[in-house]
Interface confidence: low
């Protein structure tokens, strides 16, 4: 006869491990007892359990409550046992020794491998701002046994770097994602993907990118200078910009205070019926926590009584 077992038994942390040991005997052969021991290199054998055909299962004190026989029905030639709630310290070499009649003793070894699934964590880097060079966007760390794989899933262009730390029974892997921040990255997902043989499916943690920026400011409303004439109603100037965080707007007049009756409504400057008093240089100030921009325009209100139109100058400044 011969013993049937596995070279390696793999189990996830906390699960039950079946340690197989089956005697494939000739007709009429019987198994008297099966002894299980842990036999790691450099250490003496540590008894787990003795499975006796007559007296049943005897478990050594160190494994009390953790070693059982598989549920019925049982084959009298099957010396397999269950190791309950596997922990990392259970990883190692095990031996089953089978005493048979009349063929004598047989022994076989297997290795128990305990997979420790990782619990990944994602840490965003410093605040991203347009104009920075290569900057850390996020780092992702996962520790497990064996070492997990950490990769990134994103449409954003960037570079990754990984480092590993080996622990006594596990390894931690940290991967960093670096990028050159630009406004187009705002709202883009950056996903850390952790793979491990102890996971049924990859674990994914998503971080949404936020890049601070402020676009150049410009003023609309003076495209047709002939519309800016005395008496015109509904004239307005609109300041155009965009930013992250969203910017705030402020209007001033360079050559004096804003004329009475002029309304400031966020990015819009609304005029009452135009008079020559409304002529002047108007400045839109745009700002957010990242930066500020200015754009100024010169308004000349035309008098229809005069023949010649006047020039309208537009100037932008940052």
């Amino acid at each position: 006869g011969e013993l049937e077992t596995s070279d390696v038994v793999t189990v996830v942390l906390g699960q039950d491990a079946k340690l197989p040991c089956f005697y494939r005997g000739d007709s009429g052969e019987q198994v008297g007892q099966v002894a299980w021991a842990r036999v790691d290199a450099g250490e003496g054998a540590q008894e787990l359990a003795l499975l006796h055909s007559k007296y049943g299962l005897h478990v050594s004190p160190a494994y009390e409550g953790r070693v059982e026989q598989p549920p019925p029905p049982r084959n009298p030639l099957d010396g397999s046992v269950l190791l309950r709630n596997a922990v990392q310290a259970d990883e190692g070499e095990y031996e089953c020794r089978v005493s048979t009649f009349p063929a004598g003793s047989f022994q076989a070894r297997l290795r128990l491998r305990v997979l420790v699934p990782p619990l990944p964590s994602l840490n965003p880097g410093p605040a991203l701002e347009e104009g920075q060079g290569l900057t850390l966007a996020a780092s992702c760390t996962a520790e497990g046994s064996p070492a997990p794989s950490v990769t990134w899933d994103t449409e954003v262009k960037g570079t990754t770097s990984s480092r590993s730390f080996k622990h006594s029974r596990s390894a931690a892997v940290t991967s960093e994602f670096h990028l050159v921040p630009s406004r187009s990255m705002n709202g883009q997902p950056l996903t850390c993907v952790v793979s491990h043989p102890g996971l049924l499916q990859d674990q994914r943690i998503t971080h949404i990118l936020h890049v601070s920026f402020l676009a150049e400011a410009s003023v609309r409303g003076l495209e047709d200078q002939n519309l800016w004439h005395i008496g015109r109603e509904g004239a307005m100037l609109k300041c155009l910009s965009e930013g992250q965080p969203p910017p705030s707007y402020n209007w001033t007049r360079l050559d004096g205070p804003l004329p009475s009756g002029v309304r400031v409504d966020g990015d819009t400057l609304g005029f009452p019926p135009l008079t020559t008093e409304h002529s002047g240089i108007y400045v839109c100030h745009v700002s957010n926590e990242f930066s500020s921009r200015d754009s100024q325009v010169t308004v000349d209100v035309l008098d229809p009584q005069e023949d010649s139109g006047k020039q309208v100058d537009l100037v932008s400044a940052s």
Epitope: A89, R163, S164, F165, K166, H167, S168
Partner: antibody, heavy 117, light 106 residues
Framework: QVQLKESGPGLVQPSETLSLTCTVS????????VHWIRQSPGKGLEWLGV???????DYNAAFVSRVTISRDNSKSQVFFKLNSVQADDTAVYYC???????????WGQGTTVTVSS | DIQMTQSPASLSASVGDTVTITCRAS??????LAWYQQKQGKSPQLLVY???NLADGVPSRFSGSGSGTQYTLKINSLQSEDFGTYYC????????FGGGTKVEIK
């Protein structure tokens, strides 16, 4: 502040067991690993083993058959035993603290152990 | 086990000098390296961990660098209190220490 202090006999007979105690203060041994390291002129610094915050142990493969590390949480003490000592086990024995990894941010002052009849 | 080879075994330097100590691992240790300072009759003190990170309270004249198998501890503007023996130690698996570098007064 963080302190570790080793105590035990300074002289041990050959073939007997060396027993040392590390008493700590300023931190909890249930939050940090406590390691044993020895230093001798012939062999330099040698890491012997550790008891981790959760109570599990790891030993240097060269000493695994001779070393046992245990602890008493209530007394903030870690115990070190080295069986079957010989003259070349004569050394200064240190206990040291670590976080998750095997580098040592605080050390005891060390205790000199001589193995001699 | 991974072997750590430290050089030089000893050196003489003066206050104000720059001192460089190197440590070579027998295989890649992925920056899992620490440096310690030990003075006569005292226990070792952590200077640098993870190859480049200064431990709390360590003066900025100390710096660590390196990757793979080659690592360096640099002391800028050596002070009188810096004399002693320096050890490297890897923590990629079972830790081992280098043989030490004794820094003496010239």
């Amino acid at each position: 502040q963080v302190q570790l202090k080793e105590s035990g006999p300074g002289l041990v007979q050959p073939s007997e067991t060396l027993s040392l105690t590390c008493t700590v203060s300023g931190f909890s041994i249930t939050n940090y690993g406590v390691h044993w390291i020895r230093q001798s002129p012939g062999k330099g610094l040698e890491w012997l083993g550790v008891i981790w915050s959760g109570g599990s142990t790891d030993y240097n493969a060269a000493f695994v058959s001779r070393v046992t590390i245990s602890r008493d949480n209530s007394k903030s003490q870690v115990f070190f035993k080295l069986n079957s000592v010989q003259a070349d086990d004569t050394a200064v024995y240190y206990c040291a603290r670590s976080g998750k990894w095997y580098y040592f941010d605080y050390w005891g002052q060390g205790t000199t152990v001589t193995v001699s009849s | 086990d991974i072997q750590m080879t430290q050089s030089p075994a000893s050196l003489s330097a003066s206050v104000g000098d720059t001192v460089t100590i190197t440590c070579r691992a027998s295989q890649n240790i992925y920056s899992n390296l620490a440096w310690y300072q030990q003075k006569q009759g005292k226990s070792p003190q952590l200077l640098v961990y993870a190859a480049t990170n200064l431990a709390d309270g360590v003066p900025s004249r100390f710096s660590g660098s390196g990757s793979g198998t080659q690592y360096t501890l640099k002391i800028n503007s050596l002070q009188s209190e810096d004399f002693g023996t320096y050890y490297c130690q890897h923590f990629w698996g079972t830790p081992t220490f280098g043989g030490g570098t004794k820094v003496e007064i010239k």
